[in-house]
């Protein structure tokens, strides 16, 4: 999946299996991504567990687990706040589109998660204090998480090696270098960037991300998934002048 | 193995009041030296983690990227408090302590918002 | 919870071979180190040997240098150790153990070798 | 390889009296980079080690306040404020400075 860090780092990596993407006292979260295609080193998200932590007198420990065509809007025990303590609706669950798109509130850590189900796969996004991402005490116990260090060198797929401003060869070039089996019906260059064009028209990190997604996969649901995690950016991002990613080696415009 | 305290002591110097620091800036690269600095500590019991070897990795790729000379000054990690978790000893009938912003609000001024992102493939 | 649980241990000749697995839950298992440590019969501890997250290095006790190899599959969050040539002082209880430097253990298996 | 030399290999307690173990290296166990890789392990009857003390004073998680560590270079004591009978087993040292990785033979606590 590609992941944009709380440092505002923009990488595509291809984990597979459970890892942390958030690790501190107060919550953890945990994306399991599988590949898109037989033999893919791409992969994309299928499930995210969430635990909120017990918290003083606010909320009881909670979890929040969404699959591949299971997007609850409720707790594993069936609930949609924290509990029975007294600041219980601190801690909400709302459900904006049945099935699609949910967002939870943790009030009392300043936080608000969104997880939507875009086609087979899910897509999480994130507005938390520094402090409460900083705040983590048993280094020992507490693992890597993607959220702040990124993705090890070792999982990343470049993206440069991949996205090309230039069509012909160049498409080709990219077409050619892409990290899946062809897709069952894998987008012509042009095609894909016409597509993306449509729903992303700035040309930034995103938009390259549902380039490389739909000639990865051939699946358009991507091109969603691209333009609902950049509107959950403008949501959720407190510095509007970093909305938009672009890679280091372009200008920015204006 | 503390490798996840130079990861995020490094996150700390990096992350400005307002802002995080620029990229290109000495104090980031003094950032990143401490960073180097932290990780060679954990070296002996962290050196079969994932952990580790990412992070020796990613400050070798960013001193490249930012071209920061491996000799120079390092920089301090600023400290944050934040009430505990789990049940604390001291119970109030006041909800602000079950909203971040006003009980933060008494300490400082607006909290520093950060986001992260996953998406696609 | 970090869960440590160790397998196929049993009784098996001298110069024989065995085989044991330790499966693991409730952490991230290709971000550690793991090690391996066993304990004879009244006996105090001994480190066997560790490897790293990835496979790419590994470390033996001289004891059983060449005679026993540690492995991991990531994908099913299992580490291995392959003990051969076994002889009468590897009896003992076999522990795995979670990180570079251990600090969770299985409740180990047993190993005996014994004509 | 690094030899550790605990003693008392045997430690008879009383009930809420404190207790002590010394852990002795035959080498230095300072790392280069001025780190003490030395851990304190305890092994309850018919259970599995359970790590207490890791880089000679820091109390794992979950560890009560009564344990604590303390030494340097090679000599490393491990003390026990009040003896709980939970606290019944055997006691090891363990370095993790020098491979390989080595442990003390094991100090036995029992309740008097």
């Known amino acids: 999946p590609h992941l944009r860090t709380f440092t505002d780092r923009f990488q595509t990596c291809k984990v597979q299996g459970a890892w942390p993407l958030i690790d501190n006292n107060y919550l953890n979260v945990q994306a399991t991504n599988t590949p898109v295609l037989p033999g893919s080193a791409a992969t994309a998200t299928s499930k995210l567990t969430i635990i909120f932590k017990n918290f003083q007198e606010c909320v009881d420990q909670k979890v929040y687990q969404a699959e591949m065509d299971e997007l609850p809007a409720a707790f594993v025990d069936g609930s949609k706040n924290g509990g029975d303590k007294h600041g219980a609706n601190s801690l909400k669950i709302t459900e904006k589109v049945s099935g699609q798109h949910v967002e939870i509130q943790a009030k009392y850590i300043g936080t608000t998660i969104v997880v939507r189900q875009v086609g087979r796969y899910l897509t999480f996004a994130v507005r938390m204090p520094e402090e409460v991402v900083n705040a983590v005490e048993d280094w020992d116990s507490q693992g890597l998480y993607l959220c702040l260090r990124g993705c090890p060198l070792n999982q990343q797929i470049d993206f440069q090696a991949f996205h090309t401003n230039a069509e012909g060869t160049g498409a080709r070039r990219l077409a050619a270098a892409s990290p899946a089996p062809t897709a069952p019906e894998t987008f012509p260059y042009e095609t894909a960037v016409a597509k993306c064009k449509e729903k992303l028209p700035v040309e930034d990190l995103y938009y390259q991300a549902c380039v490389f997604d739909l000639l990865t996969t051939g699946d358009v649901n991507f091109t969603l998934a691209a333009y609902y995690a950049l509107e959950d950016v403008k949501m959720l991002h407190s510095n509007k002048d970093k909305l938009h990613l672009y890679e280091r080696t372009r200008d920015l415009p204006g | 193995c503390k490798i996840l305290k130079c990861n995020s002591e490094f996150w700390s110097a990096t992350s400005g009041s307002h802002a995080p620091a620029s990229d290109d800036t000495p104090e980031f690269c003094a950032a990143l030296r401490s960073y180097a600095l932290c990780t060679r500590r954990t070296a002996r019991t962290c050196r079969g983690d994932l952990a580790y070897h990412s992070a020796v990795h990613g400050i070798e790729d960013l001193m490249s990227q930012h071209n920061c000379s491996k000799d120079g000054p390092t920089s301090q990690p600023r400290l944050r408090t934040l009430p505990p978790a789990g049940d604390s000893q001291e119970r109030s009938d006041s909800p602000e302590i079950c909203h971040y912003e006003k009980s933060f609000h008494k300490h400082s001024a607006t909290p520093n918002y950060t986001h992260c992102g996953l998406f696609g493939d | 919870e970090v869960q440590l649980v160790e397998s196929g241990g049993g009784l098996v000749q001298p110069g024989g071979s065995l085989r044991l697995s330790c499966a693991a839950s409730?952490?991230?298992?290709?971000?550690?180190?793991m090690n391996w440590i066993r304990q004879a019969p009244g006996k105090g501890l001994e480190w066997i040997g560790m490897?790293?997250?990835?496979?790419?290095?590994?470390h033996y006790a001289d004891s059983v240098k060449g005679r026993f190899t540690i492995s991991r599959d990531n994908s099913k969050n299992t580490l291995y150790l392959q003990m051969n040539s076994l002889r009468a002082e590897d009896t003992a209880v076999y522990y795995c153990?979670?990180?570079?430097?251990?600090?969770?253990w299985g409740q180990g298996t047993m190993v005996t070798v014994s004509s | 390889d690094v030899v550790l030399t605990q003693s008392p290999l045997s430690l008879p307690v009383t009930l809420g009296q404190p207790a002590s173990i010394s852990c002795r290296s035959s080498?230095?166990?300072?790392?280069?980079?001025?780190?003490?890789?030395l851990e304190w392990f305890l092994q309850k009857p018919g259970q599995s080690p359970q790590l207490l003390i890791y880089?000679?004073?820091n109390r794992f998680s979950g560890v009560p306040d009564r344990f604590s560590g303390s030494g340097s270079g090679t000599d490393f004591t491990l003390k026990i404020s009040r003896v709980e009978a939970e606290d019944v087993g055997v006691y090891y040292c363990?370095?993790?400075?020098?491979?390989?990785?080595?442990f003390g033979q094991g100090t036995k606590l029992e309740i008097k």
């Open positions: 363990f370095q993790a400075t020098h491979d390989p990785l080595t």
């Open positions: 409730g952490f991230t298992f290709s971000n550690y180190g």
């Open positions: 153990a979670k990180g570079t430097t251990p600090d969770y």
């Open positions: 080498q230095s166990l300072e790392y280069s980079d001025g780190y003490t890789f």
């Open positions: 880089e000679v004073s």
């Open positions: 490897i790293y997250y990835d496979s790419s290095e590994k």
